[in-house]
């Protein structure tokens, strides 16, 4: 148990981390679901996209998200790792030209249409809390993760290392 400082230790210097190169090291098309197997879906409503967390009916097709993986380097004076402190950052795009964004003021996750280069709000540090689950930490707000709240995606502050494994910030990626 690390307490609050443990999470801060894990997440320090995210603000200063630089993404090495402008092209992703890989891209992966996957459906996104919660730890409890609810699907993340995207619906076009009034010319903007809404994000939902819901149970799909049997045989209903899951929405796919393009995850683009970027290498990010920690500054050596921050991480103590020299050039060795690499992280993976991802952007998530459910449809062409739209990306998930962290709205830190509203504690919300939104879909925005934008051009590259993408703003920092579109980048999330990839964590594996379990072998088959991932979590997405805001590049712009260390210690804040995409999570599920009231059947929507929201930004959730994680204030202790124990809470890094709470189910509402865990997601599953699936090719099917």
């Amino acid at each position: 148990a690390f307490g609050i400082s443990g999470v801060q230790k894990y997440t320090r210097a995210l603000h200063d981390s630089s993404i090495t190169g402008i092209s992703p090291i890989t891209e992966y098309l996957a459906s996104l679901s919660t730890y409890n197997d609810q699907s993340i879906t995207f619906a076009l409503e009034d010319e903007s996209y809404e994000i939902y967390v819901e149970d799909l009916k049997k045989d209903e097709k899951k929405d796919k998200v393009l995850l683009s993986y970027y290498e990010s380097q920690h500054p050596s004076n921050e991480s103590g790792d020299g050039v060795d402190g690499k992280m993976l950052m991802v952007t998530l795009s459910p449809t062409k030209d739209f990306w998930l964004h962290a709205n830190n003021k509203e504690h919300s996750v939104e879909l925005h249409k934008c051009e590259k280069p993408l703003p920092d709000q579109a980048f999330f540090v990839l964590h594996n809390m379990h072998s088959n689950c991932v979590s997405f930490e805001c590049k712009t707000d260390p210690g804040v993760f995409i999570g599920v709240k009231d059947n929507h995606l929201a930004l959730i502050k994680v204030d202790s290392s124990e809470n890094l494994c709470t189910e509402n910030i865990l997601f599953k990626l699936s090719e099917t």
């Epitope: 890989t26 993976l88 990839l126 090719e175």
Partner: antibody, heavy 122, light 107 residues
């Protein structure tokens, strides 16, 4: 410079126990998943155990599940493998490895220790 | 479990040859595929990760390609120090699995 140094190997009788240690230095240990990989004499590589960077999750193949336990002590920058009910087929060089990136498992194992030999024989 | 089948299990080649080693997965997965080189009595060395990304410090004559179930390691011009055993490894799904290895010997 990243360094991983294993210790604790040796000769043990079938059914016996052994505890391997891996001393890590040169990087922020508690940010990385850590993994044990073994190699039987003249054979290929086999994954043995992995532990999350938080220490909250541990994973094993069926061949060692229930007999081996991976653990970590972040205060000591150390990784451990407790091996019980050892069998002849566990004879191998055991390597301590580190993940490529902070916080996750992607990207293979860029750092390996020198290995420690475990021999299970009567 | 994802089985990784490497071929050939051994090959003989000369310095300057182009060498190709393949790894076939029993099921498709994201490209979390790594290639390692191992010399006798030494620890494995990571050459390629993410199927095609060259690890820092590895000579550019090594390259990786492939996706889904078929992956390839290519050495464009074999050098004397490249005679070794090569392993592929998938990290996409647990249990993590390695290929059986390819021993590259001097012709």
């Amino acid at each position: 410079e990243v360094q991983l140094v294993e210790s604790g190997g040796g000769l043990v009788q079938p059914g016996g126990s052994l505890r391997l240690s891996c001393a890590a230095s040169g990087f922020t240990f508690n940010n990385y998943w850590m993994t044990w990989v073994r190699q039987a004499p003249g054979k290929g590589l086999e994954w043995v155990a992995s532990i999350t960077y938080t220490g909250g999750g541990t994973y094993y193949p069926d061949s060692v599940k229930g007999r081996f336990t991976i653990s970590r002590d972040d205060a000591k920058n150390s990784l451990y493998l407790q091996m019980n009910s050892l069998r002849a087929e566990d004879t191998a060089v055991y390597y301590c490895t580190r993940a490529n990136y902070y916080y996750n498992t992607y990207g293979g194992f860029p750092y390996w220790g020198q290995g420690t030999l475990v021999t299970v024989s009567s | 479990d994802i089985q990784m089948t490497q071929s050939p299990s051994s090959l003989s080649a000369s310095v300057g040859d182009r060498v190709t080693i393949t790894c076939l997965a029993s099921e498709g997965f994201s490209n979390d595929l790594a290639w390692y080189q191992q010399k006798p009595g030494k620890s494995p060395k990571l050459l390629i990760y993410a199927a095609s990304r060259l690890q820092d410090g590895v000579p550019s004559r090594f390259s990786g390609s492939g996706s889904g179930t078929d992956f390839t390691l290519t050495i464009s011009s074999l050098q004397p120090e490249d005679f070794a055993t090569y392993f592929c490894q998938q990290g996409s799904k647990y249990p993590l699995t390695f290929g059986g290895g390819t021993k590259v010997e001097i012709k």
